[in-house]
Amino acid sequence: LPAQVAFTPYAPEPGGTCRLREYYDQTAQMCCSKCPPGQHAKVFCTKTSDTVCDSCEDSTYTQLWNWVPECLSCGSRCSSDQVETQACTREQNRICTCRPGWYCALSKQEGCRLCAQLRKCRPGFGVARPGTETSDVVCKPCAPGTFSNTTSSTDICRPHQICHVVAIPGNASMDAVCTSTSPTRSMAPGAVHLPQPVSTRSQHTQPTPAPSTAPGTSFLLPVGPSPPAEGSTGD
């Protein structure tokens, strides 16, 4: 004969435990139903009545099966340097990620707590390592034979043009200037185009450069003074 199915609430067998999606209520000393995502326990169970669940109120949620008296509060609205990639619903918290041209300087379990603007490499310096969702751009001095004349978080050091007759020789921050005859481009070692960093989130697949007026590393929360990284812009 099949074992009889127990309906909540029920007393567990001596030494036994409650089933999946049930919890043991210490006061009632019974196995009782948990509440599904999007709900919470409005009335806890007794020896004769099961848990009464109720929907989460606005701006609150539960993502997991639970027996909590109140739903969890959704995080605060996304800041101006962030994009809301997941809205606050009864079953999930709001998720904020950094907008293009910014990276996550202080992450949380999901999304980002604090975004910072990607470092811009100043003229004479190029991008050695592009920024990602969670790491800043790394700048490096342009090697002999290469230059960068921009302040950019994406531009690498490019090779000087090769002139038949040089009018002005190139340096780290300026291309060579040739006389009127047609120049040719050299391919300096390591002169590979680095693409703009692309976020793993689909919303970020078309990044746009950040405003050029912003400082190199602009945190939205006050931070202690620190010298600008080599090759990055700073006051």
Epitope: P14, Y24, Q26, L64, E110
Partner: antibody, heavy 128, light 112 residues
Amino acid sequence: QSLEESGGDLVQPGASLTLTCTASGFSVNVNSYMCWVRQAPGKGLELIACIDTGSGGSTWYGSWAKGRFTISKSTNLNTVTLQMTSLTAADTATYFCARARNTYGYGDYVYGGAFDPWGPGTLVTVSS
Amino acid sequence: DIVMTQTPASVEAAVGGTVTIKCQASQSISSTYLSWYQQKPGQRPKLLIYQASTLASGVPSRFKGSGSGTEFTLTISDLECADAATYYCQGGYFSDNGCYNAFGGGTEVVVK
């Protein structure tokens, strides 16, 4: 329903020690939520670790306690133990075990509130 | 983590008087997760109040708990000599990556 701690001792810095909490009048193996709390001489209460002794078996540690302290249950002995390693003078305290009379749960996480009963405590002294 | 801050650290009052102890949570918590304990020197803590305002069994009605969000209060009226003790609050909350639980620093009540 009562609890009693044992295993407190005078030990040298760097030593390890295991404390035991024995329950009477109820089974810790049936869905109890048991915690260890300590109190340094003349100081306040500090929550160390908790264990859901039911099917979940989830554990909780104070952020400062992760790594050096391990809470576990012994099904056949009706006990909960606290293993402590790399002890220092700062660990000198009376160690209490307590049972939460209310629990609340979110996924695998369990919150134990309203500790009752408490054991009388066991003294751990770390000194050279 | 959560920090429970109790004020004052110590308070003195006369027999028959009233004492108010405040407990502030570092972030908003459900009143369901707030408890108060009494501890006398050399003894184990004793549960006084749970769910912010519910008296534990055998606790006289002179003890009253109240509050919500981040501010909770324990009020002891008609003070008796036996109320001389240290009182602790305990509270916590859930998040998607865990559960947080802590005691306050304690308030010593001296009865004159």
